[in-house]
């Protein structure tokens, strides 16, 4: 049928919870293409009706929730004007055992459910949540050995759990839990993560480089909205935390009540030798108290600030 076959690695999935897989294969999906999902080489496409438990949502296949019988090979066919690619995804459903203390790690989990913390460092775990825009995700709760994580060494930031001064006791079985809402229905997502520890620097001890800001000032009018990107290059294997702080406090915590100033979601682009990270800070409305205050972008041991200043008066207007 003239389609190129591409085989993705197997995905191990948890029964009784939502799961989604996005059919993207750059640069194929960057142009004008049509994407259709099929199961087990069936000629009948996966339903696009949003009420269906399994349905296609734009380029995604969405399971609400995943069930035992859903194991199998799924194909998404990407058709362009002059091309056709068929991507095969093998999904295997298993019963989750996050609270079974006899299970010392779950060896068949995919890599994003195995994470490493670096002893003596400030590090983080990531709750990988890959869902289409139609899915609304609530706040994330974190658990270790089935107990909710508390304590001043732990901070929840977006999809990450920040762990300060990692110790040997931090290894073990973690889970992140979030409520997903789709078409008015709620579902629980519980991702188990096996967390191991290492003393190795892991990235050769190199220091992340903050490309912008450069300890510079920005002229901005009172009352305006402002978005500033922090651009960082770092090694591919780095474990550095990237965030915005003011008065040595995470901006999301400092402006917790008003939410007037917020940190954005981190994105990254992967290059051959390094990753380029971007994390922005948004001022919904610049206030007088913001001027002259250093807003610090942190990346591991590196830091750089921006300072807001009022524009110089334009005497030509008089």
């Amino acid at each position: 049928d003239g389609c190129n076959d591409i085989f993705m690695k197997n995905e191990m999935l948890s029964a009784s919870q939502p799961f989604a897989f996005n059919c993207t294969f750059p640069p194929i999906t960057s142009g004008e293409v049509s994407v259709t999902w099929y199961k087990n080489s069936s000629k009948i496409p996966v339903s696009k009706i949003i009420q269906s438990r399994i349905h296609q949502d734009e380029t995604w296949i969405l399971f609400l929730p995943m069930e035992w019988g859903d194991s199998g090979v799924y194909q998404c066919v990407i058709k362009g004007r002059d091309s056709c690619h068929r991507i095969h995804v093998n999904l295997t459903v298993f019963e989750k055992q996050w609270c079974d203390t006899s299970v010392k790690g779950l060896p068949n989990l995919s890599d994003e459910y195995k994470q490493i913390l670096h002893l003596g460092k400030d590090d983080s775990l990531t709750c990988h949540l890959h869902f289409p825009k139609s899915c609304i995700l609530g706040p994330i709760k974190w658990y270790k050995d089935c107990n909710e994580i508390t304590g001043e060494r732990f901070t929840v930031l977006e999809t990450r759990l920040l762990v300060s001064n990692v110790s040997a006791e931090d290894r073990g079985n973690y889970a992140c839990q979030v409520i997903l809402t789709h078409s008015g229905k709620q579902y629980e997502v519980l991702n188990g993560i096996t967390v191991s520890i290492t003393e190795r620097a892991g990235y050769g001890g190199s220091v992340p480089k903050i490309i912008y800001p450069k300890n510079n000032s920005i002229e901005v009018q009172l009352g305006t909205t402002l978005i500033v990107d922090c651009n960082i290059t770092d090694t591919k294997d780095n474990t550095n935390l990237r965030c915005w702080r003011v008065n040595n406090t995470l901006v999301d915590d400092y402006y917790n009540e008003s939410k007037r100033i917020r940190e954005g979601v981190e994105t990254h682009a992967s290059f051959r030798e390094y990753n380029l990270y971007t994390v922005n800070i948004t001022f919904l409305e610049v206030k007088m108290e913001d001027y002259g205050l250093p807003f610090m972008c942190h990346a591991g041991v590196s830091a750089a600030y921006i300072m807001l200043q009022l524009p110089a008066p334009d005497f030509r207007a008089y």
Partner: antibody, heavy 120, light 106 residues
Framework: QVQLQESGPGLVKPSQTLSLTCTVS??????GYWNWIRNHPGKGLEYI?????????YYNPSLKSRVTISRDTSKNQFSLKLSSVTAADTAVYYC??????????????WGQGTLVTVSS | DIQMTQSPSSLSASVGDRVTITCRAS?????MYWYQQKPGKAPKLWIY???NLASGVPSRFSGSGSGTSYTLTISSLQPEDFATYYC?????????FGQGTKLEIK
């Protein structure tokens, strides 16, 4: 059960390149750290280097100018190349990995080792 | 580089003896790892994170220490314990081993 198996020539001529491969079963080399260690005859263990889950490589500075560790994720293998060898590189070479009790540095799984002799 | 010095380099002892092997680091290390190696065999993880015994290691073995001084102790030596023991650190690269302590039957 994680298993590692070294393979490669047992005899290498001086000034040539030593090449060994470690084939892994029971675990994916895209998780954890994958190490090379050698044991000189009648001497102790020497840490050569590792390749990590992301493909990052670390080399012992004493060997850095001569060593390359690479991987082939499709075959679940990682390899060691040591250039410009001399008789001092004669040793039993081991591949090993950790992760025991969630400790990556605890090298619990080892290959059986392969003796490489450098001689003309 | 952190130098790891094991003492003694070799030790003759009898079955039933209490034996202590010391590993001294030239700078502070966070944790110590110990390996047992028998002739013609690959090393085996013996003690990790300074004091934790690996699977299958008898309880007569123990590990302790902090900073620059670490010890492996055998409370009552058994015939199968005769081997070479190595310490290793991961705190600072390069990740150095001690030169080994060869435990022999007296």
């Amino acid at each position: 059960q994680v298993q590692l198996q070294e393979s490669g020539p047992g005899l290498v001529k001086p000034s040539q390149t030593l090449s060994l491969t470690c084939t892994v079963s029971g675990a994916s080399i895209t998780s954890g750290y994958w190490n090379w260690i050698r044991n000189h005859p009648g001497k102790g263990l020497e840490y050569i280097g590792y390749i990590s889950y992301s493909g990052y490589t670390y080399y012992n500075p004493s060997l850095k100018s001569r060593v390359t560790i690479s991987r082939d994720t499709s075959k679940n293998q990682f390899s060691l190349k040591l250039s410009s060898v001399t008789a001092a590189d004669t040793a039993v070479y081991y591949c090993a990995t950790g992760g025991y009790d969630y400790v990556e540095d605890a090298l619990y799984y080892w290959g059986q080792g392969t003796l490489v002799t450098v001689s003309s | 580089d952190i130098q790891m010095t094991q003492s003694p380099s070799s030790l003759s002892a009898s079955v039933g003896d209490r034996v202590t092997i010391t590993c001294r680091a030239s700078s502070n290390v966070r944790y110590m790892y110990w390996y047992q190696q028998k002739p013609g065999k690959a090393p085996k993880l013996w003690i990790y994170l300074t004091s934790n015994l690996a699977s299958g290691v008898p309880s007569r073995f123990s590990g302790s220490g902090s900073g620059t001084s670490y010890t492996l102790t055998i409370s009552s030596l058994q015939p199968e314990d005769f081997a070479t023991y190595y310490c290793q650190q991961y705190t600072t690269s390069p990740y150095t081993f001690g030169q080994g302590t060869k435990l022999e039957i007296k």
